[in-house]
Interface confidence: low
């Protein structure tokens, strides 16, 4: 998790509504960016990761979470950038795979509602040089289109690299979903067993003692054939 340096070590004057957190990664490796947020305030909202060409300019969408908010925990890819949202834990995670020097720049984590977007966190991605830099195609800014970032209050952070093929621990929402489904199955099986044992007709279900955290968003009946596969961000290009 990123750590913050004291104020005196961070960038000059404020002026920005949101502080900017710096995530540093090594070229050629993966960088994981986390954006914490208030899960209640942003309940039901999709999230997005965008790249900002200028401090005051619009933010260009890179990738967004699944169209169905319930499935936000599924990782979606656009090129080498992935996004996944732990909606209960309140953490948006973006993975930049095979980080390159030209991936450096200013980004935003956003919470979407209608045609509007709230900024969850401003992120400055810094890429530390790798001696085995192959100089391949990737991203660059337009210098003519950019404005100075001198006003940014920067909280320097180091992000742990996610190794290729490493599976991150499942977010809270996935674990809770699985637990709910598992317990519902047990309750249903118990009810059927009890009904058969007592010779009753299994037409009604007993009231469930588990409400899965009172979150209507997770009251799924079944998820047939659903796998935690990668989703490409086709609709937000």
């Amino acid at each position: 998790y990123p750590y913050d340096v004291p104020d005196y070590a961070s960038g000059g004057g404020g002026g920005l509504e949101h502080n900017t957190t710096v995530f540093q990664g090594v070229a050629g490796q993966s960088l994981q960016v986390s954006c914490p947020y208030d899960s209640m305030k942003h309940w039901g909202r999709r999230k997005a990761w965008c790249r900002q060409l200028g401090e005051k300019g619009p933010c260009q969408r890179v990738v967004s979470t699944h169209n169905l908010w319930l499935l936000s925990f599924l990782r979606r890819w656009n090129g080498s950038t992935a996004i996944t949202d732990d909606t209960l834990g309140g953490t948006l995670t973006i993975t930049l795979r095979n980080l390159q020097p030209h991936d450096a720049g200013l980004y935003q984590c956003q919470s979407l509602h209608g045609s509007e977007a709230d900024t969850l966190r401003k992120v400055l991605v810094e890429v530390l040089a790798d001696p085995l830099d192959h100089r391949d195609a990737g991203d660059l800014w337009f210098p003519g289109e950019s404005e100075s970032f001198e006003d940014a209050h920067v909280e320097h952070s180091i992000s742990r690299s996610l190794l290729e093929g490493e599976i991150p621990f499942p977010p809270t929402s996935i674990l809770l979903l699985l637990a709910c489904i598992f317990l519902i199955k047990i309750l249903a099986a118990s009810a059927l067993w009890a009904a058969a044992w007592h010779g009753q007709k299994p037409g009604t279900h007993p009231p469930s003692e588990l409400d899965c955290g009172h979150d209507p968003g997770y009251q799924l009946q079944t998820l047939p054939g659903l796998r935690d596969t990668d989703y490409k961000d086709d609709d937000d290009k």
């Epitope: 260009q60 030209h102 450096a104 100089r135 660059l140 800014w141 003519g144 100075s148 970032f149 290009k237």
Partner: antibody, heavy 122, light 113 residues
Framework: EVKLLESGGGLVQPGGSMRLSCAAS????????MNWIRQPAGKAPEWLGL??????????EYNPSVKGRFTISRDNTQDMLYLQMNTLRAEDTATYYC?????????????WGQGVMVTVSS | DILINQSPASLTVSAGEKVTVSCKSS????????????LAWYQQKPGQFPKLLIY???YRHTGVPDRFTGSGSGTDFTLTISSVQAEDLAHYYC?????????FGAGTKLELK
């Protein structure tokens, strides 16, 4: 596959006007800055101007050498780019190219059309 | 406007030789915010349109053979072809994309002996 195809060139008299078109396909047109470049025979290319993408309100930039005479526009419903050229001069004779800037390529022109010849002569 | 001085104007080499083309700009093309140089190299074969080889001074465009290398920073840039092939016969242009109007070098014509 990214494709850019120019049309509308030909012969025009000095002082006349001409409108060039560029049909784009194979990419999300509204996401990209689009450019016009010309190249007189045997000379280096000359950047004429660009029109920005949706995120930047389709605003334009021009080379001072043609500003006021040339106008760049786009029809995003048809994925078309246009160059309106007025008060043409003999020195405007060249091959005209439309080209795409991938925003992620630092302003460089990653795809070009085949070009269309414009001859300004009486 | 930023002026680009490209040299040499022409080169005659044998297949397999190493070639270097130089571009010097009238002001620095290094943009401090992104720590990148905004210079591109294009190859234009006879009767064809220019094709992007290198962007950001040193990044090879997709599909460009690795015998093409871009280097340099600030005001001095170089395109190197490590071992010239017959299909490399073309004009080579550099272009600055640091500020408007974008400007091209005069070009280098590469010919084979």
């Amino acid at each position: 596959e990214v494709k850019l195809l120019e049309s509308g060139g030909g012969l025009v008299q000095p002082g006349g006007s001409m409108r060039l078109s560029c049909a784009a396909s194979g990419f999300t047109f509204t996401d990209f800055y689009m450019n016009w470049i010309r190249q007189p025979a045997g000379k280096a290319p000359e950047w004429l101007g660009l029109i920005r993408n949706k995120a930047y309100g389709y605003t334009t930039e021009y080379n001072p050498s043609v500003k006021g005479r040339f106008t760049i526009s786009r029809d995003n419903t048809q994925d078309m780019l246009y160059l309106q050229m007025n008060t043409l001069r003999a020195e405007d004779t060249a091959t005209y190219y439309c080209a795409r800037i991938g925003i992620n390529y630092g302003g460089s022109l990653d795809y070009w059309g085949q070009g269309v010849m414009v001859t300004v002569s009486s | 406007d930023i002026l680009i001085n490209q040299s040499p104007a022409s080169l005659t080499v044998s297949a397999g030789e190493k070639v270097t083309v130089s571009c010097k700009s009238s002001q620095s093309l290094l943009y401090s915010e992104s720590n990148q140089d905004y210079l591109a190299w294009y190859q234009q074969k006879p009767g064809q349109f220019p094709k992007l080889l290198i962007y950001g001074a040193s990044y090879r465009h997709t599909g460009v053979p690795d015998r093409f290398t871009g280097s340099g920073s600030g005001t001095d840039f170089t395109l190197t072809i490590s071992s010239v092939q017959a299909e490399d016969l073309a004009h080579y242009y550099c272009e600055q994309t640091y500020s408007y109007p974008y400007t091209f070098g005069a070009g280098t014509k590469l010919e084979l002996k």
